[in-house]
Interface confidence: low
């Protein structure tokens, strides 16, 4: 540009561009100065004067340099699945998590928009894959001389334990009964757990002005090219 | 310009399988949810299933097994496979864009609609 | 499986009345509601979004209501163009659904 062209708005050289933080109107056909972020603009700009800017109103954000006429709506407050980890402000939308023990099971590019609890695997069958912020549990039937006989979405198939004498041979939802001599080999007490996932995906919830109840899961998990893990139930 | 345009439909008989394709002009269909709705001779609209960003297809309840949604990125197309057709089936079939508004790449409407595609099913 | 009901099925107007159509979900979908209008032949044409929200190039006689399980749509001065079959569609959930859309008001000159 020519060093004396400095304010907006200017009419910009054939085949340039506006500079950093400067678009170029089309009715004006002149770069104007965009708004900073928790602004947006008020009055465009013509030929003689530059955009005016104004300030987000409450529940309203603009997040990057911009020439909206209206702040964008943040999300409706976050619903009961989820937990809130970024305030609505005058620059950036509100953000919710999904909850421990919620996946995020349908997602957008900047987010979340439905989260869903982790599938529980019944008695007889284990976590095969744990669940992650974005991806649900996966169970198995637990494999001979493996048990599960809790329903949870943590808990893996764990070895019978081994008796000098069986009282009670094991299956697969059911640990070995031994007769009252004590058995060789056992787990440590408890059932095994792993570790729950921390949900870090933001959600951009629905912009309504009621927060949302959280769905029935039931509801949420895609139809992929596979059917759900054979033991899973909804909750 | 945004435009939409279905083809592939047609007269088949009962127990086949055809192909609807929707081509996609003026934006990158990979960006948007894509769906596929129905409507059959004097009937009203009937949702067939969706596409997300990401790739995943969701379907009708009645659609499950029978219907697939894809989508080619390099050829900017969307795709429904139907198979085991029924007379049930017949309808014209409309692809349509999520609007994705407001820098949001999910709205839960459509906006724009092909002009669709007849398909008849029938011996 | 979440279930859209409109009321009525069609209804007879005159032009300038005023008309207003609802829509029920069978839960709640807080605003994620649209509205379409449909004419003979034609692909159905987005009128209303996020339950309230008009449409770019929709004229401001169409208006929508409403938030988690009722809705409506009001046409507040009914015009010649707007004899047509009018939807609602919920785009809040779509898994384990039979059908997103409700099953259509036709409007109809008296």
């Known amino acids: 540009l020519p060093a004396q062209v400095a304010f907006t708005p200017y009419a910009p050289e054939p085949g340039s561009t506006c500079r950093l933080r400067e678009y170029y109107d089309q009715t004006a056909q002149m770069c104007c100065s965009k708004c900073s972020p928790g602004q947006h603009a008020k009055v465009f700009c013509t030929k003689t004067s530059d955009t005016v800017c104004d300030s987000c109103e409450d529940s309203t954000y603009t997040q990057l340099w911009n020439w909206v006429p209206e702040c964008l709506s943040c999300g409706s407050r976050c619903s009961s699945d989820q937990v809130e980890t970024q305030a609505c402000t005058r620059e950036q939308n509100r953000i919710c998590t999904c909850r421990p023990g919620w996946y995020c099971a349908l997602s957008k590019q900047e987010g979340c928009r439905l989260c869903a609890p982790l599938r529980k695997c019944r008695p007889g069958f284990g976590v095969a894959r744990p669940g992650t912020e974005t991806s649900d549990v996966v169970c198995k039937p637990c494999a001979p001389g493996t048990f599960s006989n809790t329903t949870s979405s943590t808990d893996i198939c764990r070895p019978h334990q081994i008796c000098n004498v069986v009282a009670i041979p094991g299956n697969a939802s059911m640990d070995a009964v031994c007769t009252s001599t004590s058995p060789t080999r056992s787990m440590a007490p408890g059932a095994v757990h792993l570790p729950q996932p921390v949900s870090t995906r933001s959600q951009h919830t629905q912009p309504t002005p009621e927060p949302s109840t959280a769905p029935s899961t039931s509801f949420l998990l895609p139809m992929g090219p596979s059917p759900p893990a054979e033991g899973s139930t909804g909750d | 310009e945004v435009q939409l345009v279905e083809s592939g439909g047609g007269l088949v008989q009962p127990g086949g399988s055809l192909r609807l394709s929707c081509a996609a002009s003026g934006f990158s269909l990979s960006d948007y949810f894509m769906t596929w709705v129905r409507q059959a001779p004097g009937k009203g609209l009937e949702w067939v299933g969706i596409?997300?960003?990401?790739?995943?297809?969701y379907y009708a309840t009645w659609a499950k097994g029978r219907f697939t949604i894809s989508r080619d990125n390099s050829k900017n197309t969307l795709y429904l496979q139907m198979n085991s057709l029924r007379a049930e089936d017949t309808a014209v079939y409309y692809c349509?864009?999520?609007?994705?508004?407001?820098?949001?790449?999910?709205?839960?409407?459509?906006?724009?609609w092909g002009q669709g595609t007849l398909v008849t099913v029938s011996s | 499986d979440i279930q859209m009901t409109q009321s009525p099925s069609s209804v007879s107007a005159s032009v300038g009345d005023r008309v207003t159509i609802t829509c029920q979900a069978s839960?709640?979908?807080?605003?994620?509601l649209a509205w379409y209008q449909q004419k003979p032949g034609k692909a159905p044409k987005l009128l209303i979004y996020e339950a309230s929200k008009l449409a770019s190039g929709v004229p401001s006689r169409f208006s929508g209501s409403g938030s988690g399980t009722d809705f409506t749509l009001t046409i507040s001065s009914l015009q010649p163009e707007d004899f047509a079959t009018y939807y609602c569609?919920?785009?809040?959930?779509?898994?384990?659904?039979?059908?997103?859309f409700g099953g259509g008001t036709k409007v109809e000159i008296k």
């Open positions: 596409i997300n960003t990401g790739g995943d297809s």
């Open positions: 839960e709640n979908i807080n605003s994620w």
């Open positions: 349509a864009r999520d609007t994705g508004y407001g820098g949001y790449d999910y709205a839960g409407s459509f906006d724009p």
């Open positions: 569609q919920q785009g809040y959930i779509y898994i384990d659904v039979g059908n997103i």
